[in-house]
Interface confidence: medium
């Protein structure tokens, strides 16, 4: 058995359903996506040995499914997947990788072929600990590269300052596949949001620990850089589920307004 979870049940149906649903979000000139063709291109990786899938095996899939990302709407992240999805609000606020077509169809899913058979493996799939060239990691590497290349304007990044190992994973998708593929000439600045879990530990904030590494790296690449601790719009969303926590107390001016009302 592999270390990762097996192929998601009803993978094809979920994929095609998400694809069809997403088409409605695209502008009319980009809506002519053929979901069946996109699935067939994706399925190429499902016909290969589960430790022999390269990022390039998804090239056709990416070419068929890619579309433009609105300027200033890109949102990169590490260790904050659910919060990013909630805040992005189905492309309304931002368009993270999970809100572009090629990311949406695979978000939170797992897939691989059986090791010595042509069928899908529903029991387990390899992770990077099992082998580097596994179907899921290779997919997200290729998708991450494309997402970076297509991003422009103000780049937003949400990181988790409560993560025990640090807000910026020095080895991670953002560090290894996204930062190197940012197109400097298309980008005006990079804005980082270091979010802390409500009631959680403050492991790192802007300018601390691994965040220093990220700041140095981006500045040395020639990017304009800014960092915000607990970006208020995201904090307010976190507070929806923790309304009575002290971290979510309204500022006195707002409270006074409430009392007058």
């Amino acid at each position: 058995r592999w270390r990762g979870e097996g192929t998601s049940a009803h993978l094809r149906d979920i994929f095609l359903g998400r694809c069809a649903e997403y088409r409605a979000l695209l502008s009319p000139e980009q809506r002519n996506k053929n979901c069946t063709a996109i699935w067939e291109a994706f399925k190429v990786a499902l016909d290969k040995d589960p430790c022999s899938v390269l990022p390039s095996d998804y090239d056709l899939f990416i070419n068929l499914s890619r579309h433009s990302i609105p300027r200033d709407k890109s949102l990169f992240w590490e260790n904050s997947h659910l919060l990013v999805n909630s805040f992005a609000d189905n492309t309304r606020r931002f368009m993270p990788l999970s809100d572009v077509l090629y990311g949406r169809v695979a978000d939170f899913l797992s897939w691989c072929r059986q090791k010595n058979d042509s069928g899908l493996d529903y029991q387990s799939c390899p992770t990077s600990e099992d082998c580097e060239n596994n179907p899921v990691d290779s997919f997200w590497k290729r998708a991450s590269i494309q997402y970076s290349k297509d991003s422009s304007g103000v780049i937003h990044v949400m990181l988790n300052g409560s993560e025990p190992t640090g807000a910026y994973p020095i080895k991670g998708f953002f560090a290894d596949y996204e930062i190197p593929n940012l197109q400097k000439e298309k980008i005006t600045r990079i804005e980082i949001w270091v979010m802390h879990e409500i009631g959680g530990p403050n492991v790192e904030s802007c300018g601390e620990g691994s965040m220093k590494v990220l700041e140095k790296r981006l500045k040395d690449m020639g990017f304009q850089y800014s960092c915000i601790n607990d970006y208020r719009p995201v904090k307010l969303l976190q507070c929806v589920d923790h309304s009575t926590h002290p971290d979510c107390a309204l500022k006195s001016a707002a409270a006074a307004t409430q009392r007058k009302a």
Epitope: V203, E204, G207, E208, G209, V213, K216, K219, D220
Partner: antibody
Framework: EVHLVESGGGLVQPGRSLKLSCAAS????????MAWIRQAPAKGLEWVAS????????YYRDSVKGRFTVSRDNAKSTLYLQMDSLRSEDTATYYC?????????????WGQGVMVTVSS | NIQMTQSPSLLSASVGDRVTLSCKAG??????LAWYQQMLGEAPKLLIY???SLQTGIPSRFSGSGSGTDYTLTISSLQPEDVATYFC?????????FGAGTKLELK
């Protein structure tokens, strides 16, 4: 063997300028962050400024911001500290130091130090 | 700025003693802490980094420990050549800060 040799110190009047240099040898200079640390006579150590490997990031302690400028010439393996509007409280031995690697800011090699005296 | 407080400021000990120096940070510094030794008239020398990692070439009688806000430098058996001032430094934030130092002398 790693060597860091500071120069350019001396006696200067308040309000005047001085430029310190640090010649590095024995390692690939462009692979390391560098910094300046000072020590007032019979006092503790005080970080002054840091610069990242390609010079894209520079950082200063609040008391020298706007007066001091750290820079580097990777081709010459030299670190600089331009000190303007000097004050008496800037009197100290200034050490050129090497950051250990790209990720952290502890300092594994130090120069012998150069004395800067600000006095009228 | 993160305040670093060292104690004691002066410590007298005998050769062979086990010596413990303390450094307290004003907030959690996530073990981003280094210890330096400065002999009289010389530049400081790195002993310990990341709270407990021994720098290459430093004798094994030196060790570091601690986490969060509280850190310790221990000399397991004091030698005459260890007479010096010891400084701790946090590098968790951009504004690296040093403690005021502990002067170690022989009794």
């Amino acid at each position: 063997e790693v060597h860091l040799v500071e120069s350019g110190g001396g006696l200067v009047q308040p309000g005047r300028s001085l430029k310190l240099s640090c010649a590095a040898s024995g390692f690939t200079f462009s692979n390391y962050d560098m910094a300046w640390i000072r020590q007032a006579p019979a006092k503790g150590l005080e970080w002054v400024a840091s610069i990242s490997i390609r010079g894209g990031s520079t950082y200063y302690r609040d008391s020298v911001k706007g007066r001091f400028t750290v820079s580097r010439d990777n081709a010459k393996s030299t670190l600089y500290l331009q000190m303007d509007s000097l004050r008496s409280e800037d009197t100290a031995t200034y050490y050129c130091v090497r950051g250990t690697d790209y990720y952290y800011d502890y300092f594994d090699y130090w120069g012998q130090g150069v004395m800067v005296t600000v006095s009228s | 700025n993160i305040q670093m407080t060292q104690s004691p400021s002066l410590l007298s000990a005998s050769v062979g003693d086990r010596v413990t120096l303390s450094c307290k940070a004003g907030r959690n510094i996530n073990s981003y802490l280094a210890w330096y030794q400065q002999m009289l008239g010389e530049a400081p020398k790195l002993l310990i980094y990341n709270a407990n990692s021994l720098q290459t070439g430093i004798p094994s009688r030196f060790s570091g420990s601690g986490s969060g806000t509280d850190y310790t430098l221990t000399i397991s058996s004091l030698q005459p050549e260890d007479v010096a001032t010891y400084f701790c430094q946090q590098y968790n934030s951009w504004t690296n800060t040093f403690g005021a130092g502990t002067k170690l002398e022989l009794k």
